[in-house]
Structure formats: C-alpha cells, structure tokens
C-alpha cells in the first residue's frame, strides 16, 4: 500500500511540477522592471524567454517576440535549452510513469518491469527538475549581474544636466514559479525512485534439494519471497482516476480604439 501511495504521489507531484515548468517557460514575467528608482512610472516593462512586453497605464500591452536567434545572448539561449530539455524529459517521464503505476494494469506486465519503468521515470523527473532549477538560476544570476551593472552606470553617469532613467530589471514571477516547479518535479522523481525499491521483487529462490530416504522422494521447492506490499500477488488494486483538472487559458482582451458597449 505504502509503495502504491508513494508512487502515485510521486506521479502527481511530478505532474504538477512539469505543468509548472511549462507555465514558467511560457510566462512573460521572467524579469520585471525594478520600480525602486521610479515607482511612479506610467510605462511598465517586463521580459520573458520568448518576448518582451510593455504595459501602459492606458491598459494597452505591447509584446514583441525575439525573432532573431543569432542576436540573442548565449545565456538566454542556454536558459531556453535547459527549460525545453526539462519539459521534454518531464513529458517522457510522465508517459513512462503512467505505464509504471501499480494501480494501472497493462496486460501481463511484471512487477520487475514496472519497477524499472518507475526508476527510469524517477530519474527523468530528477533530471527534468534539475534542468528547470538550473535554467531559472542561470537567468536569475544574469539578472543580478545586469542589475548591479546598471546600478553602477546609474551612479557614475550622473554628471550630465539631463537625467536618463535607466531601466533596471528584477526577478519576475516566472522565476519563482520555475524554482517551485523544478523542486516539485525533483521531489516527485525522488519519490518515484523510492517507490521503485518497493516494487522490485527481491528474488531469493533457493535451489531445490531432493532427499531420497527409504524409497520416499520429497522435493522442497520454496517459491521466491516477495517484498510485502500489503497486497497478495493475486490481488489487484484498481483505481479509476477522474481527470477533473481542466486548464483554461484566459485570453485577456485588450482594448481596441472603438470598443462599443
């Protein structure tokens, strides 16, 4: 029972984590304008991995995609790569772990096969989580470096008569989503690996010993012992999961010039 629970929980936690990694990767708020120096700006800038946006007080938001590949910083490319690798590994891991779930019966799949699949998916989740955490951390480090560089420029270039407000960027919501999601995927992966140990049958088959005494032949053939899971080998615990989680992408409609009531 404990193994099934651990495996199921690991799957759910990983699923939430991967959903979070996908969400973080798609989010535009990886870096947001630091308002400390100019808290009353009428124009708010924020940037994602794929595009940069400007939100005006008017309610209009303009986003521009990074349509170049060669012109982008290597670090940004690296972050993109890490996040995508994390998503791909996580998605494959989810696919593998679905078939590995103890509560799902597929043909005559043996527990040893399920154990191997659970371990594989667990490792995939761990690597996926680490990729996401690494990607977010690299981006955060990039922000910190740029933040202090622009702060230095701000205070060294104040000799002129005309003030130029330097736009500094700080951590956006996507970073925190990414860190949490990566952590969840990692935890889910560890749980899957733990569950794998409980699923693997510990084969302790003793060689059959025959005793020939006074014409009677007795053969002892003890069966292999299975690690106790709380369920007999013939007992199958079937559960039906109703996928009730529906995600709706709320498309925020921005005003048009003539928005009639």
């Amino acid at each position: 029972m404990a193994v099934t629970a651990c495996q199921g929980l690991g799957f759910v936690v990983s699923l939430i984590g991967i959903a979070g990694i996908i969400a973080a990767t798609c989010m535009d708020q990886w870096s947001t304008q630091d308002l400390y120096n100019n808290p009353v700006t009428a124009v708010f800038n924020y940037q994602g991995l794929w595009r940069s946006c400007v939100r005006e007080s008017s309610g209009f938001t303009e986003c521009r995609g990074y349509f170049t590949l060669l012109g982008l910083p290597a670090m940004l490319q690296a972050v993109r790569a890490l996040m995508i690798v994390g998503i791909v590994l996580g998605a494959i891991g989810l696919l593998v772990s679905i078939f590995a779930l103890k509560c799902i019966r597929i043909g005559s799949m043996e527990d040893s096969a399920k154990a191997n699949m659970t371990l594989t998916s667990g490792i995939m989740f761990i690597v996926s989580g680490l990729c996401a955490i690494a990607g977010v951390s690299v981006f955060a480090n990039m922000l910190v470096t740029n933040f202090w560089m622009s702060t230095a420029n701000m205070y060294t270039g104040m000799g002129g008569m005309v003030q130029t407000v330097q736009t500094r960027y700080t951590f956006g919501a996507a970073l925190f989503v990414g860190w949490v999601a990566g952590g969840l995927t990692l935890i889910g992966g560890v749980m899957m690996c733990i569950a794998c140990r409980g699923l693997a049958p510990e084969e302790t088959n003793y060689k059959a010993v025959s005793y020939h005494a006074s014409g009677h032949s007795v053969a002892y053939k003890p069966g292999g012992f299975k690690a106790s899971t709380g369920f007999g080998s013939n007992t199958k615990n079937k559960k039906t999961y109703d996928g009730g989680a529906h995600t709706e992408d709320e498309l925020q409609s921005y005003p048009s010039k003539h928005d009639y009531v």
């Epitope: 700006t41 124009v43 800038n45 005006e56 008017s58 309610g59 521009r64 010039k257 009531v261």
Partner: antibody
Framework: EVQLVESGGDLVQPGGSLKLSCAAS????????MSWVRQTPDKRLEWVST????????YYSDSVKGRFSISRDNARNTLYLQMSSLKSEDTAMYYC???????????WGQGTAVTVSS | DIVMTQSPSSLTVTAGEKVTMSCKSS????????????LTWYQQKPGQPPKLLIY???TRESGVPDRFTGSGSGTHFTLTISSVQAEDLAVYYC?????????FGAGTKLELK
C-alpha cells in the same frame, strides 16, 4: 460613438467638497485607463489624477494628493473625482479623458467648471 | 518631476508657412523596453477641450492631417506644421506620458499675422 460627459462642477467655498462625475458611453470604462486634467484660468493644463485600467493603481499630482480621490463605477460606466478641502487654486475647468496608446488622452469631455471662492 | 519646456510661447505666422515648435523635457522620455518616446502633442482651440494630435512623439492620431509631424527623441521634441492653415490657429501643448506626474508644457500659441 465614444463620448465623455462631465458634471458636478459648481461654486464652492474654500475648505468645501465637491464630487465630479464623468459619464462614459461608446466603450467599456473598466478596460481603459482614465485621467482627470484641469485647465486653470491662465490656460495652463495640469494633470490631476489617473486610474489605470482594471482600477488597481491610482496616481495624483502633488498639489491634490490627500485631498482628491479618483474612482470608477464600472456598472454605471462612470468615472468620479471626489474633491475635499478645496482651495482657491483648485479653481479650474476639469476635464476627464480616456487613455489611449502611449498614455495619450484620445477622447476628452467638454469639461465642468469648478470655482472655489468665498 | 519631469519639467516640460515649450518654445516659443507664441508664434505669428502667415497661411501656407512652415512652422516648427519645440518641447524639451528635463528627463529622457524614451522607454528602453519598446524604444518609444512617451511624448504627446495636443491642439486646443478656444472654447474647446484639447485634441490629440501626436502620441509616442511621432505617431499621428487617426484623422489628423498629414501636415502635422512629430519628431525627436529622448529630451528634445519638435512639432512641425508643413503648411499652416487658418484652422490650425490654436494653442499646442506637449505632455510627458512616461512618468507620473504627467506634466504638460506651458503651450505654444499659434497666431495669424
């Protein structure tokens, strides 16, 4: 057709209060940032206050901060400016305007006159 | 606060003449996020509310004649009327739309000779 109609302007004594209204038609008020701008007797334009789309943030000029309050009633499609502790320097023509691209005001009302005098 | 300085305060012109008026800000109005200047030009005729002419320093509002041109970047901006018409006689205001308070210039009054 987009229309903004201000009302509520009056002659008021110093220290008094007044509530200006700006009835909007032809667009959904909640989806746009809105501003109040006043024009003093010497014809200078002075920005008074802004409420951004969604109505989360409000901004005020230093001269009215703490005395004026901008709000909106989305159900009535109306913008308000609650003015209190009025001073003689608040005497002006008050305009409400809709914010467009670049935070520019693309539509203005005809204005409502506020006179603060004893 | 960003201070907006308009010059000249008044201009006397003849119909058909090319007119240029200036607007300077104490701080840059250029937003690095979209490389746009948050400066707006308004026209106000007597007894009327101001009318939007130019936003983002150089983008003409729909319905505004193409004789009106906005230019400039950072702190120096210009409104040019290529051939002044009688209906252009008004006061022209520039406004900072980048940072609160959204300050206006004192205006440039366009008059006929």
């Amino acid at each position: 057709e987009v229309q903004l109609v201000e009302s509520g302007g009056d002659l008021v004594q110093p220290g008094g209060s007044l509530k200006l209204s700006c009835a909007a038609s032809g667009f959904t008020l909640s989806r746009y940032g809105m501003s109040w701008v006043r024009q003093t007797p010497d014809k200078r334009l002075e920005w008074v206050s802004t409420i951004i789309s969604g109505g989360i943030n409000t901004y005020y000029s230093d001269s009215v901060k703490g005395r004026f309050s901008i709000s909106r009633d989305n159900a009535r499609n109306t913008l308000y400016l609650q003015m209190s502790s009025l001073k003689s320097e608040d005497t002006a023509m008050y305009y409400c305007g809709r914010l467009y691209y670049g935070n520019a005001m693309d539509y203005w009302g005809q204005g409502t006159a506020v006179t603060v005098s004893s | 606060d960003i201070v907006m300085t308009q010059s000249p305060s008044s201009l006397t012109v003849t119909a058909g003449e090319k007119v240029t008026m200036s607007c300077k800000s104490s701080q840059s109005l250029l937003n690095s996020g979209n490389q746009k200047n948050y400066l707006t030009w308004y026209q106000q005729k007597p007894g009327q509310p101001p009318k939007l002419l130019i936003y983002w320093a150089s983008t003409r509002e729909s319905g505004v004649p193409d004789r009106f041109t906005g230019s400039g970047s950072g702190t120096h901006f210009t409104l040019t009327i290529s051939s002044v018409q009688a209906e252009d006689l008004a006061v022209y205001y520039c406004q900072n739309d980048y940072s609160y308070p959204l300050t206006f210039g004192a205006g440039t009054k366009l008059e006929l000779k």
